[in-house]
């Protein structure tokens, strides 16, 4: 029979027009239209009707253009492995899920399936920021001048230094990568130990 | 033993509506596809079209303006609906089951048939 | 669409005869998509043959399918006085469903 311009046509050479929304019945050899996503087979082609498909019932999706029989079931983001959802599972879309806050990918399978704790960054470090939060553990890197971070932590961020003559006040003591500057009121002595030293 | 019984009026006037009833007994109408076909007096058979137990609908090009299936699975029932009718249309109407999984397409179980006489 | 022309129009025959009906397509009609049914008068047509040549349920064995392409046949190895009716063929390979116009098989 002729070539149709819309399924099932016949095939000869096993591909179809549309590969995204069609798809190759070998035991008839025609092509057949695919089911939209949110949507299973509920009845598969012959050569003379297209596939007909049906919604997903509640807590189950086909997140693609398909020829499932079935729809897979909704699964939950599981917070004994680190997750937590950032959005609900629909017909058309699984459960989305993330590594919760402090935590990283360690199990990658199409998808994170495992998060552990970031690892702590020492003073004078920060963790370097990465395109996509949760995605690897932390990578610490040192602190840029003028900033300092003074705690043992897998989130906190280097600070600027602080300004003295900002606030009015003078230096007392320089800020290193683990400390602030120290300040002092112009008009205090220099503390024993600093006596004779000129502040730059 | 799944039957089928087709119903519906005798005679109906031209250029009005044909409807006619089939009752699937013995079995679910779920998970098949359903089939009307007609034979004139005297003649061979024509297939009108198919219908799906979830509504979905296959329609013979040649009856496909005037014709519309409908399926009702709370009651086991399909439904045809031939509009604008005409004295071509007297026929013994039959309903079917589609059989897809061996045959593909052939109408493995049927009913006895009913008459409809377009006539004023 | 693909138009079934069946041959002969009327068989006469006896009972114990072997009966060759023919059915040829206007155009190749897959082997899986041919189709043959019985009908008795008064009756719906039953299915006796699907696939070419796949007997339906319950259907005896006396009864078998054959061909290809555009020619195909249906034979009855044995006539039985309950065989005499009308046999049409039935193609389901392209939109729209066809059916031929029938063979008449009636005692001689």
């Known amino acids: 029979s002729q070539p149709q311009a819309v399924p099932p046509y016949a095939s000869e050479n096993q591909t179809c027009r549309d590969q995204e929304k069609e798809y190759y019945e070998p035991q008839h050899r025609i092509c057949c239209s695919r089911c939209p996503p949110g949507t299973y087979v509920s009845a598969k082609c012959s050569r003379i009707r297209d596939t007909v498909c049906a919604t997903c019932a509640e807590n189950s999706y086909n997140e693609h253009w398909n020829y499932l029989t079935i729809c897979q079931l909704c699964r939950p983001c599981d917070p004994v492995m680190g997750l937590e959802e950032i959005a609900p599972c629909t017909s058309k879309r699984k459960t989305q899920c993330r590594c919760q806050p402090g935590m990283f990918c360690a199990a990658w399978a199409l998808e994170c399936t495992h998060c552990e704790l970031l690892s702590d960054c020492p003073p004078g470090t920060e963790a370097e920021l990465k395109d996509e939060v949760g995605k690897g553990n932390n990578h610490c890197v040192p602190c840029k001048a003028g900033h300092f971070q003074n705690t043992s932590s897998p989130s906190a961020r280097c600070q600027p230094h602080t300004r003295c003559e900002n606030q009015g006040l003078v230096e007392a003591a320089p800020g290193t990568a683990q400390s602030d500057t120290t300040c002092k009121n112009p008009l205090e002595p220099l503390p024993p130990e600093m006596s004779g030293t000129m502040l730059m | 033993q799944v039957q089928l019984q087709e119903s519906g009026p005798g005679v109906v006037k031209p250029s009005e509506t044909l409807s006619l009833t089939c009752t699937v007994s013995g079995g679910s109408i779920s998970s098949y596809f359903w089939t009307w076909i007609r034979q004139p007096p005297g003649k061979g058979l024509e297939w009108i079209g198919y219908?799906?137990?979830?509504?979905?609908?296959n329609y013979n090009p040649s009856l496909k303006s005037r014709v519309t299936f409908s399926v009702d699975t709370s009651k086991n029932q399909f439904s045809l609906k031939l509009n604008s009718v005409t004295a071509a249309d007297t026929a013994v109407y039959y309903c079917?089951?589609?059989?897809?999984?061996?045959?593909?397409?052939?109408?493995?179980?049927w009913g006895q048939g009913t008459m409809v006489t377009v006539s004023s | 669409e693909i138009v079934l022309t069946q041959s002969p129009g009327t068989l006469s025959l006896s009972p114990g005869e072997r009966a060759t009906l023919s059915c040829r397509a206007s155009?190749?009609?897959?082997?899986?998509?041919l189709a043959w049914y019985q009908q008795k008068p008064g009756q719906a047509p039953r299915l006796l043959i699907y696939?070419?040549?796949s007997r339906a349920t319950g259907i005896p064995d006396r009864f078998s399918g054959s061909g290809s392409g555009t020619d195909f046949t249906l034979t009855i190895s044995r006539l039985e006085p309950e065989d005499f009716a009308v046999y049409f063929c039935q193609q389901y390979d392209t939109s729209p469903i066809t059916f031929g116009q029938g063979t008449r098989l009636e005692i001689k």
């Open positions: 219908i799906y137990y979830s509504g979905s609908t």
């Open positions: 079917a089951r589609v059989e897809t999984i061996m045959a593909f397409d052939a109408f493995d179980i």
């Open positions: 155009q190749s009609v897959g082997s899986s998509y």
């Open positions: 696939g070419a040549s």
